[in-house]
């Protein structure tokens, strides 16, 4: 039985050219996290964090995606094209798969403030 919940940073905004942390957190379960996949709005892979093998960063993003903090992901040198949904998929044992969603808005404005908060989707 899957008892856990994924908490995410929810809807966040950040400046063009800046960076942002994408963060998910699995709570309310004792399940072991074996792998976390990070995907972009079009479901293309950004990164994988395997508990035993470490990180795999999709090659085209290696110059602007930094692993961490923790199981999260840091997106750097943001462009307007980075606006959209991001998904974290947690493979766990024995529970199975959990999925969280984050919406990132990249703003042109020089006064855009980075906002982030944890929420349960």
């Amino acid at each position: 039985m899957m008892t856990g919940t994924i908490e995410t940073t929810g809807n966040i905004s950040a400046k063009k050219g800046g960076s942002v942390i994408l963060q998910c957190h699995l709570s309310s379960t004792m399940a072991q996290v074996t792998q976390v996949n990070w995907e972009q709005h079009d479901h293309s892979l950004l990164a994988i964090r395997n508990a035993e093998l470490g990180w795999h960063i999709y090659p085209a993003f290696k110059d602007r995606v930094a692993p961490g903090p923790g199981l999260g992901l840091t997106l750097q040198s943001l462009t307007m094209n980075d606006t959209g949904e991001y998904f974290c998929t947690y493979h766990t044992y024995p529970d199975g798969t959990y999925r969280g969603r984050i919406f990132l808005e990249v703003l042109e404005s020089s006064v855009a403030e980075h906002s982030a908060r944890f929420q349960i989707p």
């Epitope: 074996t34 892979l45 395997n50 508990a51 035993e52 093998l53 795999h56 999709y58 090659p59 290696k62």
Partner: antibody, heavy 119, light 107 residues
Framework: EVQLVQSGAEVKKPGASVKVSCKAS????????MHWVRQAPGQRLEWMGR????????KYNEKFKSRVTITVDKSASTAYMELSSLRSEDTAVYYC????????????WGQGTTVTVSS | DIQMTQSPSSLSASVGDRVTITCRVS??????LAWYQQKPGKSPKLLIY???TLAEGVPSRFSGSGSGTDFTLTISSLQPEDFATYYC?????????FGPGTKVDIK
């Protein structure tokens, strides 16, 4: 065109070490992780470890952890695998293999380097 | 370690035959399975990753299916260049492990 060109065959005595090189070309070396896999005569493939050429961080198969070291020379776009305390059962073909786009599998392989351990 | 078994260990087939190879894994690996082809004296060649995604340049007669612990590689119409040994590999944990191989030879 992606190419992984490995160093030539080696004959070593038990207890010695061997260092195999893998020169990469046709892609950005630091963007793709590199794996090392070996195959003893008539046997299945056996994964030894992987390295991130950008950071130098590596992960090893526990079976080889005390004897294997995987390194890179970024300026030469070359990965290396050194295996120490050789024994006869280390006689095998050793392959470097580039990690694929979408995970921990390997999409391009070197031609292989035969290492023979014999007294 | 995750254990991999393949069946059959060898098979004889004719050009044009439909060939199916099975890979069984000791624990759930979701869809993190790759298939490779290896010819004598040559390096392995990637055919399929993520259980069913065809690698670049691989003919469409090759297909993969399955998830969890049971996976299948199918060659819809065997061609002369397909006579080789086929290996499955999980790409999910440390150590990455390979199946013992299935040798496909000419009947």
């Amino acid at each position: 065109e992606v190419q992984l060109v490995q160093s030539g065959a080696e004959v070593k005595k038990p207890g010695a070490s061997v260092k195999v090189s893998c020169k990469a070309s046709g892609y950005t070396f630091t963007n793709y992780y590199m794996h090392w896999v070996r195959q003893a005569p008539g046997q299945r493939l056996e994964w030894m470890g992987r390295i991130d050429p950008d950071s130098g961080g590596s992960k090893y198969n526990e079976k080889f952890k005390s004897r294997v070291t995987i390194t890179v020379d970024k300026s030469a776009s070359t990965a290396y695998m050194e295996l120490s305390s050789l024994r006869s059962e280390d006689t095998a073909v050793y392959y470097c293999a580039r990690e694929g786009h979408y995970g921990f599998y390997s999409d391009y392989w070197g031609q292989g380097t035969t290492v023979t351990v014999s007294s | 370690d995750i254990q991999m078994t393949q069946s059959p260990s060898s098979l004889s087939a004719s050009v044009g035959d439909r060939v199916t190879i099975t890979c069984r894994v000791s624990e759930n690996i979701y869809s993190y399975l790759a298939w490779y082809q290896q010819k004598p004296g040559k390096s392995p060649k990637l055919l399929i990753y993520n259980a069913k995604t065809l690698a670049e340049g691989v003919p469409s007669r090759f297909s993969g299916s399955g998830s969890g612990t049971d996976f299948t590689l199918t060659i819809s119409s065997l061609q002369p260049e397909d006579f080789a040994t086929y290996y499955c590999q999980h790409h999910y944990g440390n150590p990455l492990t390979f199946g013992p191989g299935t040798k496909v030879d000419i009947k």
